[in-house]
Structure formats: C-alpha cells, structure tokens
C-alpha cells in the first residue's frame, strides 16, 4: 500500500461537475471550455504507472483548461489552504490556484492507477515519500507553474505564521515551482500576508526566521516586496469562528461606542 489516500470516489463525476459549474464564472470569451475533452486530457495520467507520471503529462490538460487570471487577483499560499479558499470566495475577492479552472477540478482530490492493473486504485496512492513522479504531485507542479506564469500585477501570498516549521517552507510548491516562474515584467510588487491562527502560537512574523529568507530571495530577484502581519480582512474572517477570543476584540473607538449604545 502507498502512503497517500486512494482515488477519490466518483472522481470523474466530481471533475466534470466542477468544470461545468466553473464555466459560468469565465469571461464570455472563454466559457466554452469542453469539459469532456479536459477530462480526457487529465485521464492520460490515470493510464500511467503511478510512479511514472511527469508534470508534462498534464500539458494538454492545462492547454485545454487554461484561462486568464485577472491582474492583481493572484493569491499564492502555503499551509493555509482552507483559509485561502474561504477568503477568495469563489473568485469574488481573489483567484488562487483552487479558483482557476485547472485547479478547481482537482482541489482536495486524489487519484492514481493501480500499480499492476488498468483500474483506479481506491485504496491508496503514492505521495512524494513513495515516489517523486506520482500523479497528484506532478499535477500540482504543472498547475503551479502555469498559475505563476499567468499571474500579473500585485502578487499576494498568504503564509501561516503559526506553522511549527516556519511561515515560508524553503522546500515547497511556492518556493520550488511558483517563485521561479513568476514573470518579472508582468509583476508590479509582491505582498505577503503572514497570518497567525486565533489562539495559536506566533512562530514567525514578517522579518523573522524563514521570512527573512523569502524577503532576501524576492528582493534578489528584483521584486518589490512588502509584508503584513495578520492582514486585517483575513483576520476578520478568522474571527468569525472565534468571536469571543481576545485576539478578535474590536479595538476601535467606534466599535467601543457601538457596544455602549
């Protein structure tokens, strides 16, 4: 058995349903995406040995599903998947990878072929600990590369300052596949949000630990860099589920006046 979870139940139906639903969010010029053709292109990877799937095996899938990402709307992340999805609000606020078509269809799913058979493996799938060229990691590598290449304007990045190993994973999708593929001539600046979990530890903030490494890397690449601790709009969203926690107390005079009234 592999170390990862097996192929998601009803993979094809979920994929096609998400694709059809997403089309309505696309611009009039791009909404005629052929979901069946996109699925068939994706399925190429499901016909290969589960440790022999390369990022390039998803090239046709990406070419068929790719669409424009509005300027200033890109939102990269590490260790904050659910918070990013909630904050992006189905492309309304931002368009992270999970909110572009080729990311949406696979978000939170798993897939692979059986090792010595043609069927899908619903029991387990390989992770990077099993083998590097597994279907899921190769998919997100290829999708991340494309997402970076198509991003423009202000680049936003949400990192988790409560993560025990540090806010910026030196080895991760953002570091290894996204930063190297940012198109410098299309980008005005990079804005990092270091979020801390409500009531959670403050492991790192802007300018500390791994964040210094990230800042140096981006500045060395010639990017204009800024960093915000606990970006308020995201913090307010976090506080929805922790309204009585001291971290969520409204500190403004206007709020105090409202409470008295």
């Amino acid at each position: 058995r592999w170390r990862g979870e097996g192929t998601s139940a009803h993979l094809r139906d979920i994929f096609l349903g998400r694709c059809a639903e997403y089309r309505a969010l696309l611009s009039p010029e791009q909404r005629n995406k052929n979901c069946t053709a996109i699925w068939e292109a994706f399925k190429v990877a499901l016909d290969k040995d589960p440790c022999s799937v390369l990022p390039s095996d998803y090239d046709l899938f990406i070419n068929l599903s790719r669409h424009s990402i509005p300027r200033d709307k890109s939102l990269f992340w590490e260790n904050s998947h659910l918070l990013v999805n909630s904050f992006a609000d189905n492309t309304r606020r931002f368009m992270p990878l999970s909110d572009v078509l080729y990311g949406r269809v696979a978000d939170f799913l798993s897939w692979c072929r059986q090792k010595n058979d043609s069927g899908l493996d619903y029991q387990s799938c390989p992770t990077s600990e099993d083998c590097e060229n597994n279907p899921v990691d190769s998919f997100w590598k290829r999708a991340s590369i494309q997402y970076s290449k198509d991003s423009s304007g202000v680049i936003h990045v949400m990192l988790n300052g409560s993560e025990p190993t540090g806010a910026y994973p030196i080895k991760g999708f953002f570091a290894d596949y996204e930063i190297p593929n940012l198109q410098k001539e299309k980008i005005t600046r990079i804005e990092i949000w270091v979020m801390h979990e409500i009531g959670g530890p403050n492991v790192e903030s802007c300018g500390e630990g791994s964040m210094k490494v990230l800042e140096k890397r981006l500045k060395d690449m010639g990017f204009q860099y800024s960093c915000i601790n606990d970006y308020r709009p995201v913090k307010l969203l976090q506080c929805v589920d922790h309204s009585t926690h001291p971290d969520c107390a409204l500190k403004s005079a206007a709020a105090a006046t409202q409470r008295k009234a």
Partner: antibody
Framework: QVQLQQSRAELVMPGASVKMSCKTS????????VHWVRQRPGQGLEWIGA????????DYSQKFKGRATLTVDESSSTVYMQLSSLTSEDSAVYYC????????WGQGTTLTVSS | DIQLTQSPASLSASVGETVTITCRAS??????LAWYQQKQGKSPQLLVY???TLGEGVPSRFSGSGSGTQFSLKINSLQPEDFGSYYC?????????FGSGTKLEIK
C-alpha cells in the same frame, strides 16, 4: 466613462497591408478582451477576432486566421489590428468593441481598398 | 464555429405594432445570446444579453426569450426610434458569430 477611439479612415492599394488602432480608456485595460468586427457596405456584422488586454490569449475567425493579427500596447491601452493581402472585398467599416459582452464600441474605421 | 440563422431578413411594421425576430443556433449555446440594434451609419448598440437581460438604458418594450438553440427578440409597441437593423450574436466563447441581421422598416 468607457471609450474606444479608433484611427481615421484608410485608403490602400490591393495586396497591401493596413494597421488600424483602437485606443481605450475609462476601464482597467488588462481585465477585458477587445474584439474587432467589420461591416461591408450594405452587409451585416462579421466577427474578425479578439485579444485579451493582458496579451495572453487571442482568437480569430477561421476566415481571418493568418491574415489578421491583433496586438496590444498595455502602456497606452491600445489594441492594433493588422490586415494583410488586402482586396477590394476588404473595403468595410472596422469596429473595435470591448468584451466580454460587446457593450462599448468604437466609432469605426473606414477602410477603402482600391487602385 | 457556431452558426446563427436569423429570420426574417427584413420586415415592415407600423408604429405601435409588436414584432418578433428569431435566431437559431447550430448547436446548444445555453442562454448565451445577445441582441444588438444598429442605426444607419452608427455603431451597434447592445440591447439584450444572456438571452433576456436588458442592456443599460434599454426600454422595457424590448424582451428576449429562448434557450439552447432557439431564441427570439420581441419589441412591443414599436416606436419610431426602433427602426433599423437587429443582429443576434452568441457569447458562448470565441469565436463569436453574428446572425445575418434583420432590417426593420416603417410600413
């Protein structure tokens, strides 16, 4: 307010090429596609092609593929259309319009192809 | 490419009458159809999009209906300013295409 200002009328010889412009203002240029549509005298509207403002995507009608070329200059929020190998059949008014719904149109550029 | 067949090619009507123009798509375009009005020597103007949503400032006497492959534009109580040409156009992804047009003339 949204405006699309097109270049002035052109008179060109058969076989030549022409490049017309469409300068946009009043909206975020990179967020929308710009379409080109032509209308020959006494005829209907004919879609030529479109390009997105960030210059990532474009598409052309099968009829104009290889002969029409759309380009953008993001710094001036201007879209250009070059049409090559012109014949008298290309004499028409050429409109640019902002996508995705073609709600805003330029005033049109009249092209006359004649020797 | 998706073909749009518009009919009639022309029609004559009087002020106050109701007219209907139809547009048939060669394949399913769901509700992604728009209608434009064009006056002589002027740029086209968006009347209706998504089959039945009226464009900015378009009078309520205009209405669109249909879905899939069959669509129509209805003009109630024709006004003098309504005379001109009308075109359907799909916005279900590029390449966009237009119908051949309907010329509406005063009887």
């Amino acid at each position: 307010q949204v405006q699309l200002q097109q270049s002035r009328a052109e008179l060109v010889m058969p076989g030549a090429s022409v490049k017309m412009s469409c300068k946009t203002s009043g909206y975020t240029f990179s967020d929308y596609w710009v379409h080109w549509v032509r209308q020959r005298p006494g005829q209907g509207l004919e879609w030529i092609g479109a390009i997105d403002g960030s210059d990532t995507f474009n598409d052309y009608s099968q009829k104009f593929k290889g002969r029409a070329t759309l380009t953008v200059d993001e710094s001036s929020s201007t879209v250009y259309m070059q049409l090559s190998s012109l014949t008298s059949e290309d004499s028409a008014v050429y409109y640019c319009a902002r996508g995705g719904l073609l709600q805003y149109w330029g005033q049109g550029t009249t092209l006359t192809v004649s020797s | 490419d998706i073909q749009l067949t518009q009919s009639p090619a022309s029609l004559s009507a009087s002020v106050g009458e109701t007219v209907t123009i139809t547009c048939r798509a060669s394949e399913n375009i769901y509700s992604y159809l728009a209608w434009y009005q064009q006056k002589q020597g002027k740029s086209p103007q968006l009347l209706v999009y998504n089959t039945k949503t009226l464009g900015e400032g378009v009078p309520s006497r205009f209405s669109g209906s249909g879905s899939g492959t069959q669509f129509s534009l209805k003009i109630n109580s024709l006004q003098p300013e309504d005379f001109g040409s009308y075109y359907c156009q799909h916005h279900y992804g590029t390449p966009f295409t237009f119908g051949s047009g309907t010329k509406l003339e005063i009887k």
